[in-house]
């Protein structure tokens, strides 16, 4: 696959992850249950990140927004905050990304500095997927450990006000946001590789290390078939060798000696 | 932690009426269906009258036509008027809410009952 291709389609990969981002921040079904088992209506409540809503079978629906931060849990604070920074760090990566695109030319800038771009790009790319993959797996064990607290409590009542508070014990399954935002997180991490793959073949080649052989004819004891000698290289039939030839040469330099990659 | 307030129970004459009151207060996201029941001295505790957040109401055989259930949404209380009341209306009555209290957490909350007496 050529860099331009690799690179496009890593940003095009990353930008639809991003979007799913974004979507399942906003989306209110992180989590959903039935509360079917009730004297007035069959009653479905989803809750999001930012909001809980309840819709009843005559389709009326009502939402409530978590207007208070000190009384939400720590987990839906924390959730909330990796979900975000995913999505700056997106949004700071498309922008990097746009500039480092090979097909886009602005200005006079070079391919070593559309290769760093494009790497702090895909570098960007690669922690908002992670970011959006943690949250939603912090929510999502959330969701399993509320439930097994739940259902261990289920018999126990508290008392409030002389009253009595019981578990409803009814099962909260994950919701569409979850699985959007675990596909996302992980498209925004594949398109971050790619990008960072991209990267590499950006590198103008002077810029690179040199690949290096060396030829320390002696110790280069290859296996042939025909005894030590043919092995070796030191039979009466074999032309003479300088123990050091040069030193190290690079794979630009001629090929001037077939004995150059006889290693095993 | 989620607490009910029940108020507006007592002592009432026959064919009168009583107005009884719930709110509900504590961590809070959503109230889906809010409710009353009572139980009458030696009988099982029985539905009054219930109301969902839309409006879907449901009640009793024995008290239709007779007691109107209305809430609040906006104050999480809910209110049962209580017409032409029989003395076989006497029983202690219970404020019944469902909440979702957090996230994957839905509690059933029963009040500490209000007394209501009709009798001459």
């Known amino acids: 696959m050529s860099v331009t291709a690799c690179q496009g389609l890593g940003f095009v990969v990353s930008l639809i992850g991003f979007a799913g981002i974004i979507a399942a921040t906003c989306m209110d079904q992180w989590s959903t249950q039935d509360l079917y088992n009730n004297p007035v209506t069959a009653v479905f409540n989803y809750q999001g990140l930012w909001r809980s809503c309840v819709r009843e079978s005559s389709g009326f629906t009502e939402c409530r927004g978590y207007f208070t931060l000190l009384g939400l849990p720590a987990m839906l604070q924390a959730v909330r905050a990796l979900m975000i920074v995913g999505i700056v760090l997106g949004v700071i990566g498309i922008l990097v990304s746009i500039f480092a695109l090979k097909c886009i030319r602005i200005g006079s800038m070079d391919d070593s500095a559309k290769a760093k771009m494009t790497l702090t790009s895909g570098i960007l790319f690669i922690i908002s997927g992670i970011c959006a993959i943690i949250g939603v797996s912090v929510f999502a064990n959330m969701l399993v450990t509320n439930f097994w607290m739940s259902t261990a409590n289920m018999y126990s009542g508290m008392g409030g006000m002389g009253g009595m508070v019981q578990t409803v014990q009814t099962r909260y399954t994950f919701g569409a946001a979850l699985f959007v935002g675990w596909v996302a997180g992980g498209l925004t991490l594949i398109g971050g590789v790619m990008m960072c793959i991209a990267c590499r073949g950006l590198t103008p080649d002077d810029s690179n290390f040199k690949a290096v052989s060396y030829h320390a004819s002696g110790q280069n004891v290859a296996y042939r078939p025909g005894g030590f000698k043919a092995s070796t290289g030191f039979g009466s039939n074999t032309r003479n060798k300088k123990i050091y030839d040069g030193g190290a040469r690079t794979e630009d330099d001629e090929q001037s000696h077939p004995t150059k990659y006889d290693y095993v | 932690q989620v607490q009910l307030q029940e108020s507006g129970g007592g002592l009432v004459q026959p064919g009168g009426s009583l107005r009884l009151s719930c709110a509900a207060s504590?961590?809070?996201?959503?109230?889906?269906?809010m409710g009353w029941y009572r139980q009458a001295p030696g009988k099982q505790r029985e539905l009054v009258a219930g109301?969902?957040?839309?409006?879907?109401?449901n009640y009793g055989d024995s008290v239709k036509g007779r007691f109107t259930i209305s809430r609040d949404n906006a104050k999480n209380t809910v209110y049962l008027q209580m017409n032409s009341l029989k003395p076989e209306d006497t029983a202690v009555y219970y404020c019944?809410?469902?909440?979702?209290?957090?996230?994957?957490?839905?509690?059933?909350?029963w009040g500490q009952g209000t007394l209501v007496t009709v009798s001459e």
């Open positions: 504590g961590s809070i996201f959503n109230i889906p269906v």
């Open positions: 109301i969902s957040t839309g409006g879907t109401t």
């Open positions: 019944n809410v469902l909440v979702v209290s957090g996230i994957g957490s839905t509690l059933e909350v």
